[in-house]
């Protein structure tokens, strides 16, 4: 999909999710993003990122892992791991701050 | 047509804790293209942004109200939820959801009005 | 932390007349993560202007915007009935997301 505001070069990234509308998509950047929801197998999808760079500084926990870059189909190759799973005390949050 | 819809209790006791919810319909809450936000407004003030979660549960708040702050997400009944912590009669507003894209904040529900009184 | 300032506090013009709208960021910001707001007393924000200049979905074309760097601008080329309410700017898309504290548009 064309992204309308005025920003740098575009690239070009692999988009693998339910929601992708192709096997590719235009973005700021690629992304990665591996997440386990309660009680699933983990689910990796890839696609583009336009907004919020700051989720792909966030450290890996044992529910999500964000990973970023900014080159042609950068994404296409990359696999993901989860945070061990930690006792319930030690649980990190998923707050990037 | 996406249609956010907040709902919650309409009044709070001081130092309880304000729950409320927000139901995403028409669209879903997984796509990764949009980041669901909450924003108060105190009457007869301006917007103050609290936070925004993501499909994956990744959060950012506002520094603010980090402290007491936290958003929560159920893909699976696509809705997304705030819990504010401790509040007094300073955490009186409306309370707005609304969905961020590359557009800008471009759904937004009607707003809850929420009273911290005893 | 960004903060934006918009100017004036209050702009009391008569329909048909053209507004002009402020908002200065304390630092540099991207033209694509700044936006404009309209709200209606009882109602929730309605998105203006995204990308400093790009119109919403069914904004009508005498609503436009412009600027970069730390000073934007938010212009109605002929107000209507319908203009006369609050407008916010905002910056979006980043780590912290801000508004200003909005200007009041008010009929003459």
């Known amino acids: 999909d064309p992204v309308k505001p005025s920003r740098g070069p575009l690239v070009t990234c692999t988009c693998e999710s339910p929601h992708c509308k192709g096997p590719t998509c235009r973005g700021a950047w690629c992304t990665v993003v591996l997440v386990r929801e309660e009680g699933r197998h983990p689910q990796e999808h890839r696609g583009c990122g336009n907004l919020h760079r700051e989720l792909c500084r966030g450290r890996p926990t044992e529910f999500v892992n964000h990973y970023c870059c900014d080159s042609h189909l950068c994404n296409h190759n990359v696999s993901l791991v989860l945070e061990a799973t930690q006792p319930p005390s030690e649980q990190p949050g998923t707050d990037g701050q | 047509q996406v249609q956010l819809q907040e709902s919650g209790p309409g009044l709070v006791k001081p130092s309880q804790t304000l729950s409320l919810t927000c139901t995403v319909s028409?669209?879903?809450?997984?796509?990764?293209?949009?980041?669901w936000n909450w924003i108060r407004q105190h009457p007869g003030k301006g917007l103050e942004w609290i936070g925004y979660i993501y499909y994956s549960g990744s959060t950012y708040y506002n520094p603010s109200l980090k402290s007491r702050v936290t958003i929560s997400v159920a893909t699976s009944k696509n809705q997304f939820s705030l819990k504010l912590s401790s509040v007094t009669a300073a955490d009186t507003a409306v309370y707005y959801c609304a969905r961020e894209a590359t557009e800008g904040f471009d759904y937004w529900g009607q707003g809850t009005l929420v009273t911290v009184s005893s | 932390e960004i903060v934006l300032t918009q100017s004036p506090g209050t702009l009391s013009l008569s329909p048909g007349e053209r507004a002009t709208l402020s908002c200065r960021a304390s630092q540099s910001v991207s033209t694509t993560y700044l936006a404009w707001y309209q709200q209606k007393p009882g109602q929730a924000p309605r998105l203006l202007i995204y990308g400093a200049s790009s119109r919403a979905t069914g904004i009508p074309d005498r609503f436009s915007g412009s600027g970069s760097g730390t000073d934007f601008t938010l212009t109605i080329s002929r107000l209507e009935p319908e203009d006369f309410a609050l407008y916010y700017c905002q910056h979006y898309g980043t780590s912290s997301i801000t508004f200003g504290q909005g200007t009041r548009l008010e009929i003459k």
């Open positions: 028409g669209g879903s809450i997984s796509s990764g293209d949009y980041y």
